[in-house]
């Protein structure tokens, strides 16, 4: 798995809805692949982490003043939806076909 | 200034172009306010950090398995442009009114 020493990348993160207390309203799936963005944003920032100009600037300032300014952070830059079957207020199962922003599609340095 | 103990917020970061070696092509300004996103993304994530569903999920998983999964990260979610006077390839001073993505407008948890 991608630790702090490795560069920013998408890693597996299986989320069980029971673990986060969402099983009270999400019937299915029981778990899903959320992914996680892990690793460092090191100089020089590679194209694959799609850095913004601000992230590039912050990385350069961090190089000069490492105690004063933090590195850019490895975060989701594009998310994907999943479909979920949930219980409404009356306990009736209903489908949300395009439940936005639940899974990481891409990671980057921001 | 916002430390690791405070919640995610926008803080001042004055960037001097000489410090980062960009004074070789940026004529003016000599420095500008880039801002920095600092602070933690703690449970529960407040509305003002505009969390994505994935950030909410990751925060809940981090609560349950703090050593396995990291917290969401405080990053720029909206950037602003600045105007710069720079030297083009032939050394001619050129004004760029909207040099995009140079300054933080908003921070959030991602």
């Amino acid at each position: 798995s991608a630790g702090a020493g490795s560069h920013c990348q998408k890693t597996s993160l299986r989320v069980n809805f029971e673990d986060i207390g969402w099983d009270s309203w999400i019937i299915a799936p029981k778990e899903y692949e959320a992914y996680e963005c892990k690793g460092g944003c090191f100089f020089p920032l590679a194209d694959d982490v799609t850095p913004t100009k601000h992230a590039i600037v912050q990385t350069l300032v961090h190089l000069k003043f490492p105690t004063k300014v933090g590195k850019a952070c490895c975060v989701p830059t594009k998310l994907s939806p999943i479909s979920v079957l949930y219980k409404d207020d009356m306990g009736v199962p209903t489908l949300k076909y395009h439940y936005e922003g639940m899974s990481v599609a891409e990671c980057g340095c921001r | 200034s916002a430390g690791a103990g405070s919640h995610c917020q926008k803080t001042s970061l004055r960037v001097n172009f000489e410090d980062i070696g960009w004074d070789s092509w940026i004529i003016a300004p000599k420095e500008y306010e880039a801002y920095e996103c600092k602070g933690g993304c703690f449970f529960p994530l407040a509305d003002d950090v505009t969390p994505t569903k994935h950030a909410i999920v990751q925060t809940l998983v981090h609560l349950k398995f703090p050593t396995k999964v990291g917290k969401a990260c405080c990053v720029p979610t909206k950037l602003s442009p600045i105007s710069v006077l720079y030297k083009d390839d032939m050394g001619v001073p050129t004004l760029k009114y909207h040099y995009e993505g140079m300054s933080v407008a908003e921070c959030g948890c991602r």
Epitope: P29, K30, P81, S83, D88, M90, V92, T94, Y97 | -
Partner: antibody
Framework: EVQLVESGGGLVQPGGSLRLSCAAS????????MSWVRQAPGKGLEWVGR??????????DYAAPVKGRFTISRDNAKNSLYLQMNSLRAEDTAVYYC?????WGQGTLVTVSS | QSVLTQPPSASGTPGQRVTISCSVT????????VHWYQQLPGTAPKLLFF??YRPSGVSDRFSGSKSGTSASLAISGLRSEDEADYYC???????????FGGGTKLTVLG
């Protein structure tokens, strides 16, 4: 008991308009994401579009063949879903179902013919 | 041409086990979100399976599975009342909604 009842189907000329309704009961309609799905005679199922709940921003999405011609709306006070169909074509002829994805109405037939 | 490919027909005799496949031919479709509907002659579709969830009233003779880029629906102990059209459905991320397979007409022989 969950019930979805469509109405408003019928015969319409090409280029014409029609408004379908779906009356919902037995569940919290205002929180549900509602879709229209159609089925041409002897053919398979085709998603038409969907409207999200107000808490999920109430946005609508449409399948490419109907985008710009069909409009989905809802009236949570009346537990009703609507499909406004304009510039109808022969290929829009189908049984139109309103659905939560888990529950479906019996469908209403729309025939586009001159 | 649907991006979810199903065989147009399948058949079996009473008591037999029949499997209907559904394969993904487009990267915008996530196999994770594939689920199944049954449409008896002259009636509206009915949800049979969503992930590992079988709605109440659906026989446990129906089971779903996924592997790689395909999903399948298995019907054991085939009965005459199982004669119907079966549709797989998935989430089309680009279209922001569900997409259906072409359907499989199941005939119970004898």
């Amino acid at each position: 008991e969950v019930q979805l009842v469509e109405s408003g189907g019928g015969l319409v000329q090409p280029g014409g308009s029609l408004r379908l309704s779906c009356a919902a009961s037995g569940f919290t309609f205002s929180n549900a994401w509602m879709s229209w799905v159609r089925q041409a005679p002897g053919k398979g199922l085709e998603w038409v579009g969907r409207i999200k709940s107000k808490t999920d921003s109430g946005t609508t999405d449409y399948a490419a063949p109907v985008k710009g011609r069909f409009t989905i709306s809802r009236d949570n006070a009346k537990n009703s879903l609507y499909l406004q169909m304009n510039s109808l074509r022969a290929e829009d002829t189908a049984v139109y179902y309103c659905t939560t994805g888990t529950y479906w109405g019996q469908g209403t037939l729309v025939t586009v013919s001159s | 041409q649907s991006v979810l490919t199903q065989p147009p027909s399948a058949s079996g005799t009473p008591g037999q086990r029949v499997t209907i496949s559904c394969s993904v031919t487009n990267s915008d479709i996530d196999i994770f979100n594939v689920h199944w509907y049954q449409q008896l002659p002259g009636t509206a579709p009915k949800l049979l399976f969503f992930h590992d969830y079988r709605p109440s009233g659906v026989s446990d003779r129906f089971s779903g599975s996924k592997s790689g880029t395909s999903a399948s629906l298995a019907i054991s102990g085939l009965r005459s009342e199982d004669e119907a059209d079966y549709y797989c459905a998935g989430l089309d991320v680009a279209m922001r909604g569900p997409v259906f397979g072409g359907g499989t007409k199941l005939t119970v022989l004898g």
